[in-house]
């Protein structure tokens, strides 16, 4: 009977990592905000994937803001983030590309990708929405930059980073520059408004890149995308401060708030935030 | 309407195994738009999730920490229902179990819950 | 693990008077397409608890529209805009952001 067999093939939770390597908002972008006073804080870079310092304003800006070194990391950086860039160095894949795909407990249709060990190959799955583990990625590329070996036996890390075979070094890898001003923001922010498959109503805020605001749109309550937001505020602060302009070599930008220019360092370049 | 019935001994000595089974109407264990939990609740501790099953493509469940290594929750197909056994009990596992739904499509959450069983550990 | 860290913890109400209860969380429970990973359950003396609010805010179906939920990141309200008799009892948070999923230590509600 093959519903008997089944049940002695459940698929356990033997040492599975928690779903996401950090919270939403670690990923948003050092906010100083709109006032004037001179606070040392601490927030996330998702590309270096360390807590950094800077200068807060003291009023608004957004939730990846720490008053300690200590506290950013706590939220922020787990075992499994700092085994993604050791493994990776080690040329080893991280354990969590070894675990099965989990859709988790939710049922919202949400297209990701896994590593498959069978095949070694990344490959789509449809992810309910909530928890299961850390062997989820948003994008193919994500993936195989993680999990999957590169052509030549090295491993490609997911920031734009590719580990050289010859002799363990960190390469920037070059990125192509098609204009002065770039959306740097989170890709999401780029897609089109998805109401998801489910049958409620539920008033949510996508952002339309076409011209530039937060619209409002009825969700279903399950699926679609992540360029969903709950309040309008939310959906302004995580894709209206995406656009940035690229200078050459350390020149910077004058901005229209009068307050003394915040250089944010990301990666391998120096990009500054226009303000919106 | 879905409900849950639960049965299993209020009694259990200490370093036995604790065993309940929740029986579903309304609903199939193997629906791929439901899981099946349980939860336990006691005055020292209020209510703590144990660990949940659900069928997707296959089988999955997951356990809380506190108590893995001694966690078992099985689906019956056959007969509808998913039970819990929980081994080498100890006084501090008295607590009311329940077992509940966890709605997976449009609501997220425990929506439908069993009657709740009261299990005493004691010699 | 995630702390749901509820208060207060016993809530003397008047009947018709609105009644609010807060629920902090030690992580922020906010997924990145918008949906709040937190839920409010109550629980009537001698009862199984009931799921009165999901993804933060939504209220389950049966649920009188005096009860709202809100908040985003860690702290989220459960609202009740006039209390009832029947609404006596202990409400808890729950959160489902990350494994092992963990409830607030309860809200009791009760009538001065």
């Known amino acids: 009977d093959s519903e008997e067999d089944e049940e002695h093939t459940i698929i356990t939770d033997t040492e599975l990592p928690p779903l996401k390597l950090m919270h939403s908002f670690c990923a948003f972008k050092a906010d100083d905000g709109p006032c004037k006073a001179i606070m040392k804080r601490f927030f996330f870079n998702i590309f270096t994937r360390q807590c950094e310092e800077f200068i807060y304003g003291g009023c608004e800006g957004n939730q990846n803001r720490f008053e300690s070194l200590e506290e950013c990391k706590k939220m922020c950086t787990r075992d499994n983030a700092n085994r993604i860039i050791k493994t990776t160095l080690q040329q080893e894949k991280p354990d969590f590309c070894f675990l099965e795909e989990d859709p988790g407990i939710c049922r919202g249709y949400i297209t990701r990708y896994f590593y498959n060990n069978q095949t070694k190959q990344c490959e789509r799955f449809k992810y309910g929405g909530c928890l299961g583990n850390m062997n989820n990625f948003e994008t193919l590329e994500e993936c195989k930059n993680i999990c999957e070996d590169g052509p030549n036996g090295f491993q490609v890390d997911n920031y734009g980073t590719q580990l050289n075979a010859v002799n363990n070094s960190l390469t920037p890898q070059s990125t192509k520059v098609p204009s002065l001003f770039e959306f740097h923001g989170p890709s999401w922010c780029l897609t089109p408004a998805d109401r998801g498959l489910c049958r409620a109503n539920e008033n949510r805020f996508y952002y339309n890149s076409v011209i530039g605001k937060c619209r409002p749109f009825k969700y279903s309550g399950c699926g679609g995308n992540e360029n969903n937001f709950t309040s309008k505020q939310e959906c302004l602060r995580a894709c209206k401060k995406g656009f940035i302009q690229r200078i050459s070599k350390g020149g910077l930008i004058k901005t229209k708030r009068k307050r003394k220019k915040q250089r944010v360092k990301i990666a391998y370049e120096e990009i500054f935030v226009k303000n919106m | 309407q879905v409900q849950l019935q639960q049965s299993g001994p209020g009694l259990v000595k200490p370093s036995q195994t604790l065993s309940l089974t929740c029986a579903i109407s309304g609903d199939s264990v193997s629906s791929d738009s439901a899981a099946w939990s349980w939860i336990r609740q006691s005055p020292g501790r209020g209510l703590e999730w144990l660990g949940i099953i659900y069928k997707r493509s296959k089988w999955y469940n997951r356990y809380a920490v506190s108590v893995k290594s001694r966690i078992t929750i099985n689906p019956d197909t056959s007969k509808n229902q998913f039970s819990l056994q929980l081994n080498s009990v100890t006084p501090e596992d008295t607590a009311v179990y329940y077992c509940?739904?966890?709605?997976?499509?449009?609501?997220?959450?425990?929506?439908?819950w069993g009657q709740g069983t009261l299990v005493t550990v004691s010699s | 693990d995630i702390v749901m860290t509820q208060s207060p913890l016993s809530l003397p109400v008047t009947p018709g008077e609105p009644a609010s209860i807060s629920c902090r969380s030690s992580?922020?429970?906010?997924?990145?397409?918008?949906?709040?990973?937190l839920n409010w359950y109550l629980q009537k003396p001698g009862q199984s608890p009931q799921l009165l609010i999901y993804k933060g805010s939504n209220r389950a179906s049966g649920v009188p529209d005096r009860f709202s939920g809100s908040g985003s990141g860690t702290d989220f309200t459960l609202k009740i805009s006039r209390v009832e008799a029947e609404d006596v009892g202990v409400y808890y948070c729950?959160?489902?952001?990350?494994?092992?999923?963990?409830f607030g230590q309860g809200t009791k509600v009760e009538i001065k």
């Open positions: 992580q922020s429970l906010v997924f990145s397409f918008g949906t709040t990973f």
């Open positions: 729950q959160q489902y952001d990350s494994y092992p999923l963990t």
């Open positions: 509940a739904r966890w709605h997976s499509d449009k609501m997220w959450g425990f929506d439908d």
